[in-house]
């Protein structure tokens, strides 16, 4: 399905609004430090050019690839070397190396100021004064902070952002209407970004076989009534979509995602009974709805897998004839029977089955060798079940903040070399698993918890790759995607770590502490807790709890004082001295 002009093809398929939005996202994800106005100028130039190609596909340069066109445009930025340093060297390369070079320079933790939310009236005025610019600014600000955000999904977020302002700026109480909607979009956006980052890491670090295995398991859970061939087709198409988006091919990705949504809605009967309400929605909403759709009900009478995968005399023959197809069918059959398992567990089981067949099909008596293969799965299943049970009990006992603190201590002891901000961010997010998953019924807890933890631990891996400091983190992150979480769970106190020297400055606080939001106060206290553990890795839970309780009391006391700064200056050193004594 070749086109004389790729840019004209995509412009016509996507329409001007989505075309411009996606080009803005692509440019903002590549050049994360460029000012908004610069990006808008580049997008307008590309859009005008695309229109000339729609009018005449044979016009000059219209036959060039999108990477060539976009790369050439990015390389016209005057301040490229001053702003981005060695990324400017990408411009000396030819495609496809130039695009690969841009991809490698995407920064998962860009040095950008946190987004500050202006007053509601200020935002509403900006929205009414220039709605188009207001929404472009949203796409730009999110895309540059989240360089792997799933671009067609970001367009959906922008549509919801627009709808929130359109509704709430007319409301009697604008703030009461708007702020909860913006909070929800922010939280959902962060979650969406992190989930997509894992998909891209899976494709880029472990290859499309790893991503396809993930997709087979997840789609088989979602669509247990679908045939294997149907699931395989969806997996192939979904892999293409995510490969494109993760590779910066955002126009192709969005176009193919729309095609996939169309296919699913035209073939609901052979996929799932749950797609109906998604398929009545407009495109962006429909694609989002299909991605989030609940699992269909399992068929009533699915037989045990023993006959085909253990008892059959043809197991090794079937495996040898088409290994990946046979393992794919095994994964499909297992996953459709177990919506109560995490995808990562299902992938571990498929890996264990594969390892058994590799060993046994070369043995003298293969059947005798693999006869008990399913018994070997029991400990693999029970490990995450027990982990979820124990951690949900701890969460229910402690509440979210103290549960986060327990994880902060646990992870700082495991990998104390990791930077404090990273440990705080990751542990806070690990701790959110409790509120997210522990309230769910038993059959939904493990898939919720373990697959969420995989997303959070991927963030640790991505940040650590940028600045590697711990061999243990590198090992857990790179050896096996499916075993990352068990690898981190198995880490113990790092005995080789030399405790960090005590620095009183780290534990010096001021009156500004009192004006912080509850969340910011927690982050400050948790930062101090990580530093304490880095200073005294062998401190007991009781010792750390004592210090943290004293800390909370000290802050509360000084924030109630008339002269807050004087209180902090006087009580701070006493707190530090008492803490050192308690941890001695």
């Amino acid at each position: 399905d070749t086109h004389k002009s790729e840019v004209a093809h995509r412009f016509k398929d996507l329409g001007e609004e989505h075309f411009k939005g996606l080009v803005l996202v692509a440019f903002s994800q590549y050049l994360q430090q460029c000012p908004f106005e610069e990006h808008v100028k580049l997008v307008n130039e590309v859009t005008e050019f695309a229109k000339t190609c729609v009018a005449d596909e044979s016009a000059e340069n219209c036959d060039k690839s999108l990477h060539t066109l976009f790369g050439d445009k990015l390389c016209t930025v005057a301040t490229l070397r001053e702003t981005y340093g060695e990324m400017a060297d990408c411009c000396a390369k030819q495609e496809p190396e130039r695009n690969e070079c841009f991809l490698q320079h995407k920064d998962d933790n860009p040095n950008l100021p946190p987004l500050v939310r202006p007053e509601v009236d200020v935002m509403c005025t900006a929205f009414h004064d220039n709605e188009a610019t207001f929404l472009k600014k949203y796409l730009y600000e999110v895309a540059r902070r989240h360089p792997y955000f799933y671009a067609p999904e970001l367009l959906f977020f922008a549509a919801r952002y627009k709808a929130a302002f359109a509704e709430c700026c007319q409301a009697a109480d604008k703030a009461a209407c708007l702020l909860p909607k913006l909070d929800e979009l922010r939280d959902e956006g962060k979650a969406s970004s992190a989930k997509q980052r894992l998909k891209c890491a899976s494709l880029q670090k472990f290859g499309d076989r790893a991503f396809k295995a993930w997709a087979v398991a997840r789609l088989s859970q979602k669509f247990p009534k679908a045939e294997f061939a149907e699931v395989s087709k969806l997996v192939t198409d979904l892999t293409k979509v995510h490969t494109e988006c993760c590779h910066g091919d955002l126009l192709e990705c969005a176009d193919d995602r729309a095609d996939l949504a169309k296919y699913m809605c035209e073939n609901q009967d052979s996929i799932s009974s749950k797609l109906k309400e998604c398929c009545d929605k407009p495109l962006l909403e429909k694609s989002h709805c299909l991605a989030e759709v609940e699992n269909d009900e399992m068929p009533a009478d699915l037989p045990s897998l023993a006959a085909d995968y253990v008892e059959s005399k043809d197991v090794c023959k079937n495996y040898a004839e088409a290994k990946d197809v046979f393992l794919g069918m095994f994964l499909y059959e297992y996953a459709r029977r177990h919506p109560d398992y995490s995808v990562m567990l299902l992938l571990r089981l498929a890996k264990a089955y594969e390892a058994t067949l590799e060993k046994c099909c070369a043995a003298a008596d293969p059947h005798e060798c693999y006869a008990k293969v399913f018994d070997e799965f029991q400990p693999l299943v029970e490990e995450p079940q027990n982990l979820v049970k124990q951690n949900c009990e701890l969460f229910e006992q402690l509440g979210e903040y103290k549960f986060q603190n327990a994880l902060l201590v646990r992870y700082t002891k495991k990998v104390p070399q990791v930077s404090t901000p990273t440990l705080v961010e990751v542990s806070r997010n690990l701790g959110k698993v409790g509120a997210k998953c522990c309230k769910l019924p038993e059959a939904k807890r493990m898939p919720c918890a373990e697959d969420y933890l995989s997303v959070v631990l991927n963030r640790l891996c991505v940040l650590h790759e940028k600045t590697p400091v711990s061999e243990k983190v590198t090992k857990c992150c790179t050896e096996s995607l499916v075993n990352r979480r068990p690898c981190f769970s198995a880490l113990e106190l790092d005995e080789a770590y030399v405790p960090k020297a005590f620095n009183a400055e780290t534990f010096t606080f001021h009156a500004d502490m009192c004006t912080l939001s509850e969340k910011e106060k927690q982050v400050k206290k948790q930062t101090a807790l990580v530093e304490l553990v880095k200073h005294k890795p062998k401190a007991t839970k009781e010792q750390l709890k004592g210090v943290m309780d004293n800390f909370a009391a000290f802050v509360e006391k000084c924030c109630k004082a008339d002269d807050k700064e004087a209180c902090f200056a006087e009580e701070g050193p006493k707190f530090v001295a008492a803490s050192q004594a308690a941890l001695a």
Epitope: N295, E297, M298, A300, D301, L302, P303, S304, L305, A306, V310, Y334, R337, H338, P339, D340, F374, D375, F377, Q378, V381, E382, P441, A443
Partner: nanobody, 115 residues
Framework: QVQLVESGGGLVQPGGSLRLSCSAS????????MGWYRQAPGKQRELVAS???????HYADTVKGRFTISRDNSKNMVYLQMNSLEPEDTAVYYC?????????WGQGTQVTVSS
């Protein structure tokens, strides 16, 4: 070794009720299906009701609205509440529990509906 034991069968008049219980002993993990089947004299064994790990329930058309299947995961128990019994419900009722590694059946319990 896994053993399933059904109980609760018996003789009941038309319109009456019975509650069947099935208890699994031994090491069974990863259950994805629990079901009740029945076999009347000279007939094939047929599915009466099943419940899957996601909580989905399925009923034979002939028992819909009269029978209710339920389970207790923590005890590996499955139940069948049978109301408005009819003579056609007379059969041996079998409990079935499945995991990926096997299909486990009980010995059956007789249900007779007769006046």
């Amino acid at each position: 070794q896994v053993q399933l034991v059904e109980s609760g069968g018996g003789l009941v008049q038309p319109g009456g009720s019975l509650r069947l219980s099935c208890s699994a002993s031994g090491s069974i993990w990863g259950i994805y299906h629990m079901g009740w089947y029945r076999q009347a004299p000279g007939k094939q064994r047929e599915l009466v009701a099943s419940i899957t790990v996601d909580g989905s329930t399925h009923y034979a058309d002939t028992v819909k609205g009269r029978f209710t299947i339920s389970r207790d995961n923590s005890k590996n128990m499955v139940y069948l509440q049978m109301n408005s019994l009819e003579p056609e419900d007379t059969a041996v009722y079998y409990c079935d529990i499945r995991n990926v590694g096997g299909d486990y059946w009980g010995q059956g319990t007789q249900v007779t509906v007769s006046s």
